[in-house]
Interface confidence: medium
């Protein structure tokens, strides 16, 4: 074991020698060429700035990306949708929109009058939410409740009309008891031509310039588009 | 990146009508509503349409309808301005801008450089 | 139409001050508000949204407060860069309207 040992510190000797005669060499040539060195550590700061600079203009590329990068999944996760059912599955709906029942619905989270919620719907390519059903009834107020809300009814032209041409007389009707009134009681000016649902899910005719809150909806279709 | 490039600006007299365009790259183009502004010096940024993503719907400044048409072709990723009986009140730096994803707004949130139009005689 | 009224049309800074400019709209506009940045020859750059939300990218010395009819633009300490002309923008309701734009200078 001693002769062991003395091998082990034969050879730690050894390898402190050489450490300390090829430090030596480092030192002096570090003294020979001290300015060179001062130069390459500003290089490698500058080039260290640039790579930090670098590093930030990706990290800001990429959350800009991060940001859009629903949008633009919109589309593709609609075609694997088809493409998975054979072209016999109805396409999903888009980024913010719900999808119930064969239709999408988006949900505003503020107010406009009657016809600037409209006008938005359309340049979604949708139009304020017709209600045809019960069942579809009871989806809306889930998701609006407790707001006033601004659905596609308007009687603006002396009958009452849904925006999609959908028949009224025969359709479905939720009116709340005494409604429609065309109350001209509010001293707002004008008749009440525009139908809103209440928090408790009946319809009122109400002043078309009231700001309410809205809801859109567009029909889907099996073409890997929304209508 | 996203990115928006006007042309087709240029002079023209009075009455005459001019067309531009729009390119538009590192998006999904069809999925946007896009938006056309104009810039002059004496009246500042003033909008002029806004078309939807599909390009069905479109609404226009009471300045310029009847005159002007938004219309925009996805499958080439173009927004087009068509400009009728130009007036010299038209002379502006034409933008269009992108209609950004504001929940229930019309804001824009991307705008090209602009192209110079001119009406004189 | 919705009127917008900004204010002041120009200022003069140090670099390190704080800058602050109003927005009025004549009627409510909720939040529905933009504060754009525009360069000499460059394109408008995007920089507040839904009134107080910073964009993607854009320095942390940039905010935005307000709602209803009453907005505020800060810029909490302007460097060299953020010599430009900001405007304000409504987007509750087409004809989308904006500002007639601050010029800022450093002094």
């Known amino acids: 074991q001693s002769a062991q040992l003395q091998a082990e510190l034969r050879s730690l000797k050894e390898a402190f020698s050489n450490f300390s005669s090829s430090t030596l060499t480092e030192v002096q040539a570090i003294s020979t060429h001290g300015g060179s060195v001062g130069d390459k550590i500003t290089s490698l700061g500058a080039k260290l700035e640039k790579q930090q600079q670098d590093l930030k203009a990706d990290h800001d590329a990429l959350l800009f990306h991060l940001k859009h990068f629903p949008v633009d999944l919109r589309f593709v996760a609609c075609q694997m949708e088809l493409l998975h059912s054979n072209g016999s599955q109805r396409t999903c709906c888009p980024v913010n929109w719900v999808e119930h029942q064969g239709s999408c619905y988006w949900f505003s989270h503020s107010g406009k009058a009657w016809a600037e919620a409209e006008k938005y719907c359309q340049l979604e390519n949708a139009h304020l939410v017709v209600i045809n059903s019960w069942e579809e009834q009871k989806f809306i107020v889930q998701h609006t409740n407790p707001f006033n809300t601004w659905i596609g009814l308007t009687d603006s032209d002396g009958s009452w009309k849904w925006v999609d041409g959908t028949d009224y007389r025969h359709n479905y009707k939720n009116w709340a008891v005494t409604q429609p009134d065309n109350w001209h009681g509010h001293e707002l000016g004008g008749s009440e031509d525009c139908v809103e649902v209440q928090p408790d899910g009946r319809w009122n005719d109400d002043f078309c310039l009231q700001v309410y809150r809205w809801v859109c909806e567009k029909r889907r279709n099996a073409t890997g588009e929304v209508a | 990146q996203v990115q928006l490039v006007e042309s087709g600006g240029g002079v023209v007299q009075p009455g005459r009508s001019l067309r531009l365009s729009c390119a538009a790259s590192?998006?999904?183009?069809?999925?946007?509503?896009m938006h056309w502004v104009r810039q002059t010096p004496g009246k500042g940024l003033e909008w002029v349409a806004i078309i939807s993503y599909v390009g069905k719907n479109k609404y226009y400044a009471d300045s310029v309808k009847g005159r002007f048409t938004i219309s925009r072709d996805n499958s080439k990723n173009t927004l087009y301005l068509q400009m009728n009986s130009l007036r010299a009140e038209d002379t502006a730096v034409y933008y269009c801008?992108?209609?950004?994803?504001?929940?229930?707004?019309?804001?824009?949130?991307?705008w090209g450089q602009g192209t110079t139009v001119t009406v004189s005689s | 139409d919705i009127q917008m009224t900004q204010s002041p049309s120009s200022r003069s800074a140090s670099v390190g001050d704080r800058v602050t400019i109003t927005c009025q709209a004549s009627?409510?506009?909720?939040?529905?508000l933009n504060w754009c940045q525009q360069k000499p020859g460059k394109a408008l750059k995007l920089l507040i949204y839904?009134?107080?939300t910073l964009e993607t990218g854009v320095p942390s010395r940039f905010s935005g407060s307000g709602s209803g009819t009453d907005f505020t633009f800060t810029i909490s300490s302007v460097q060299p860069e953020d010599i430009a002309t900001y405007y304000c923008q409504q987007y509750d309701n087409v004809p989308i309207t904006f500002g007639q734009g601050t010029r800022l200078e450093i002094k």
């Open positions: 839904d009134a107080s």
């Open positions: 590192g998006f999904t183009f069809s999925s946007y509503g």
């Open positions: 009627q409510d506009i909720s939040n529905y």
């Open positions: 801008a992108r209609r950004g994803n504001s929940y229930g707004g019309y804001g824009m949130d991307v």
